[in-house]
């Protein structure tokens, strides 16, 4: 968090040691939402440090986080999802640093799953399909997906395709023949909710066939 102190607030520069980031996940466990925060500096001594969220909550003023190793975590139905919450790092009941955050702007979707690739010989293409738990959700239903694929030997040469559906067709002519490919997918909120990319799905590996020139056929 950057910015100038105002009206008695401690200046943010003094509190760089305790800078933290958070992400929310809506309906992550039935109708329960979660909020996860962690210090940006992995070497921060978190002994005696607590996190608390206040404001934009239903029926309660504040909630305390549970500590799970180096992350701080809340699972609750009590997020109002409108307005800004104040998330503070505290020690002995005293706030060290705080951030005003709208939980609808820090949403991290769940990772897509069941990624698979089917080759269609007649169509000379590959149909990529995957699933997302968000199709069943009531809040973060609309996602943008990033499908990334690469030839296994090309370490950092990922090709990316953005799409809003869970199905993609890759044309065989755009891929190298007789090559092993790795493909994976991740998601980000789209429409009202904002936030971060999900984790990547587990990778799927597939091999492209050799070019099969039957008599009278032209090379593509």
């Amino acid at each position: 968090e950057s910015g100038y102190a105002q009206n008695g607030d401690l200046e943010d520069a003094e509190l760089d040691d305790y800078s933290f980031s958070c992400y929310s996940q809506l309906e992550v466990n039935g109708s329960q939402h979660s909020l996860t925060c962690a210090f940006e500096d992995p070497d921060v001594n978190t002994t005696n440090l607590e996190f608390e969220i206040c404001g934009a909550l239903v029926e309660v003023k504040c909630l305390s986080f549970r500590k799970l190793q180096e992350i701080y975590f809340i699972e609750t139905k009590k997020f109002l999802l409108i307005g800004k919450s104040n998330i503070c790092v505290k020690v002995g009941g005293k706030s060290l640093t705080c951030k005003k955050i709208d939980l609808t702007t820090i949403v991290k979707p769940e990772a897509p799953f069941d990624l698979s690739v089917i080759y269609r010989e007649g169509a000379n293409d590959f149909v990529v399909t995957f699933n997302t738990s968000h199709l069943q959700k009531k809040y973060v239903k609309v996602l943008m997906h990033d499908v990334a694929y690469r030839q296994e030997k090309d370490e950092n040469k990922w090709m990316h395709v953005n799409l809003s559906s869970t199905k993609l067709t890759l044309l065989q002519r755009n891929l190298q023949p007789e090559a092993m490919y790795e493909i994976k997918v991740r998601s980000i909120p789209d429409h009202y909710f904002k936030g971060f990319w999900s984790e990547w799905s587990p990778s799927y590996y597939f091999r492209t066939p050799e070019i099969n020139n039957s008599p009278g056929e032209m090379d593509p």
């Epitope: 950057s2 100038y4 105002q6 009206n7 409108i82 307005g83 009531k138 009202y192």
Partner: antibody, heavy 118, light 111 residues
Framework: QVQLQQSGAELMRPGASVTLSCKTS????????LHWVKQTPVRGLEWIGG????????AYNQKFKGKAILTSDRSSSTTYMELRSLASEDSAVYYC???????????WGTGTTVTVSS | DIVLTQSPASLAVSLGQRATISCRTS??????????MHWYQQKPGQPPKLLIY???NLESGVPARFSGSGSETDFTLNIHPVEEEDAATYFC?????????FGGGTKLEIK
Amino acid sequence: QVQLQQSGAELMRPGASVTLSCKTSGYRFTDYELHWVKQTPVRGLEWIGGIDPKTGGTAYNQKFKGKAILTSDRSSSTTYMELRSLASEDSAVYYCTRSGGRWYFDVWGTGTTVTVSS
Amino acid sequence: DIVLTQSPASLAVSLGQRATISCRTSESVSIHLLHLMHWYQQKPGQPPKLLIYGASNLESGVPARFSGSGSETDFTLNIHPVEEEDAATYFCQQSIKDPYTFGGGTKLEIK
């Protein structure tokens, strides 16, 4: 308490530009986005755009793109709106307002009356 | 743009009675239980004042005689019992989609 103090009334010639200011106090400037709203008797209240003082990021109503330019100055906790190529239809009361959440407006400035006349 | 239509354009209510103002939107402004509709009060020569956010949440410091309800495309602001100081123009506003738009206003007169 939270206050948004706007600059005084302006009488402008057509074609001119004017910059309105909105000085905030009573809260940490970078914690809340600031927006501008136009009010006329004919068209009522119209959202012009908003700025995030933390990042400088802006969002505009398509209708006001090129007409309004929003900036902010963290050192003085002030946001500004420049209105360009003024015409009679820009005559209005302009409010700066703080966004308490996405995107409702929980604190409003006093308003600045801009009159465009030859 | 999402169009907000308020009705009535004006109404006169006796002191102590109920005032009901409607706001209809041209498309849904709800995402499940998140209703992105807000209500403001404006008195002559003053800026608007936030009364209700998220369709039904009372802004801090606003008297409990103000209440809001509704979902999807139909929203209502209720004032009961109406007091003299409630004479004003009331506006609804949606925030689901940019540009964030306002209703045309409802002028409340106290009889």
